[in-house]
């Protein structure tokens, strides 16, 4: 797609295999694990990235699997089923025929069941709250400067339309970034907030999916902004369906 002929790579996704076998000898890149052709001028979908991550050698996986008491996405990594467009299939199952329903960012939204479990539709995650804590600094960051830097990051690095960054909240040392994108708002070609949030999550953990310059260089008026922990909360257009047993 966009990789130059002389060195066929995918700028937006390290987890690809590329070769100059596209039309006219153009570079074509396919995601590891699925073999799906990806558009290297934009973000790769989270589903294809998770699948690629699970197909990589175990020692290449640097993240620790969250334990069962983690607040968010507490199922951790799994090998997802993706549709031909790279979206998560509504129903996911593991090798032992345990199945569950997921939302558009691949997070479980029902209790686990068996192969008879039905997931009628892929429910869209329309609101993502990214909760960050930054490392101690001499003083608090100026809120408007911090807001501008983070909005610029999502616009430039992830190519997320500015209208989808709903708000940036700050109470030192906690920063919250709110992403909102309803089904009706997302036009063809728009980056999905779930994909942008996943790329951001990997970036702040020092596991950038981009080739080239590498990691983030977040600065507010020249002062480095270093993130020491991240939590991401997902809100779906239709509330999740968990039994009361899970809530107690």
């Amino acid at each position: 797609h966009t990789a130059a002929q002389d060195n066929c790579t995918c700028p937006t996704n390290k987890m690809t295999v590329c070769s100059p076998d596209g039309p006219g000898g153009r570079c074509q890149c396919r995601a590891l694990g699925s073999g799906v052709a990806v558009d290297c001028s934009t973000l790769t979908s989270k589903c294809l990235l998770l699948k690629a991550r699970m197909s990589a050698p175990k020692n290449a996986r640097t993240l620790v699997r969250p334990n069962e008491h983690a607040l968010v996405d507490n199922d951790g990594l799994y090998d997802p089923d993706c549709d031909p467009e790279g979206r998560f299939k509504a129903r996911q199952c593991n090798q032992t025929s345990v199945c569950w329903c997921v939302n558009s960012v691949g997070v479980r939204r029902t209790d686990k069941g068996d192969l008879s479990l039905r997931c009628d539709e892929l429910v869209r995650t329309h609101h993502i709250l990214i909760d960050l804590r930054h490392r101690p600094t001499a003083g608090a960051f100026n809120h408007s400067d911090l807001d501008a830097e983070l909005r610029r990051l999502f616009r430039e690095r992830y190519r997320l339309h500015p209208k989808f960054v709903a708000a940036v909240h700050y109470e030192q040392p906690t920063i919250q970034i709110e992403l909102r994108q309803n089904t009706s708002q997302k036009a063809a070609g728009d980056v999905d907030i779930g994909d942008a949030a996943y790329y951001f999550e990997r970036d702040v953990k020092g596991e950038s999916l981009f080739q080239g310059r590498g990691g983030l260089d977040l600065r507010v008026r020249g002062e480095p902004l270093q993130v020491e922990r991240t939590l991401i909360y997902y809100l779906d257009e239709i509330p999740p369906k968990f039994s009361m047993k899970r809530l107690t």
Epitope: A4, N7, S41, E156, R219
Partner: antibody, heavy 126, light 105 residues
């Protein structure tokens, strides 16, 4: 308005070194990447290199790699190009340029340049 | 790739629409106008399709895959210039095209 003023050009001897300085004004210098681009007489534009806003990252064209160093002083709003072991083919007009996309995964791209200096002429000759 | 690929020249009558293409880059494209050799380039389009506020609205840019297009809708005599495209290769080295000379007949 954005202003970029280059200085330090002139007649240089082969094998010697030059130091070009670009003084920036009219924008928050600390927030933007800076580029150097050159143009040989009668030829097209050629990307020389880039420095990110903090000065922690630089990238150079193969033609100058190992001979060029780009540095910046955010306090003085200046960016410098040091070019050593000069050759006749280094002759041309050197432009300082402002980047617009410091977070982009393709931030080094010439497609991110939004403002240019007037240029300073360098002649390498014995 | 040592340079981006663009046509060496295009010509048009005043009022016509002109398209100049550029291919072979990886990442953002920009378009730069140079009215005479040795004069400073002027950015017409950056980041594929962003136009600076002092650039007339008849200039527009688009990009699809590894090809970018500069469109001048209703070309004028004062648009006569050499237009360079800029991007990068996949090793993140910046690149320019050799330039397209626009002649307004």
């Amino acid at each position: 308005a954005v202003t970029l003023d280059e200085s330090g050009g002139g007649l240089q001897t082969p094998g010697g070194g030059l130091s070009l300085v670009c003084k920036a004004s009219g924008f928050d210098f600390i927030d933007y990447d800076m580029f150097w681009v050159r143009q040989a007489p009668g030829k097209g534009l050629a990307w020389v290199g880039v420095i990110n806003r903090s000065g922690s990252y630089t990238n150079y064209a193969p033609a100058v790699k190992g001979r060029a160093t780009i540095s910046r002083d955010n306090g003085q709003s200046t960016v410098r190009l040091q070019l050593n072991n000069l050759r006749a083919e280094d002759t041309g007009t050197y432009y300082c340029a402002k980047g617009v996309c410091t977070h982009c995964w393709d931030a080094d791209s010439a497609g991110n340049i939004d403002a240019w200096g007037h240029g300073t002429e360098v002649i390498v000759s014995s | 790739a040592l340079a981006l690929t663009q046509p060496s020249s295009v010509s048009a009558n005043p009022g016509e629409t002109v398209e100049i293409t550029c291919s072979g880059g990886s990442g953002n494209y920009g378009w730069f106008q140079q009215k005479s050799p040795g004069s400073a380039p002027v950015t017409v389009i950056y980041n594929n399709n962003y136009r600076l506020s002092d650039i007339p609205s008849r200039f527009s840019g688009s990009a699809s895959g590894s090809t970018a297009t500069l469109t001048i809708t209703g070309v004028r005599v004062e648009d006569e210039a050499v237009y360079f495209c800029g991007s990068a290769d996949s090793t993140y080295v910046g690149l320019f095209g050799a330039g397209t000379t626009l002649t307004v007949l």
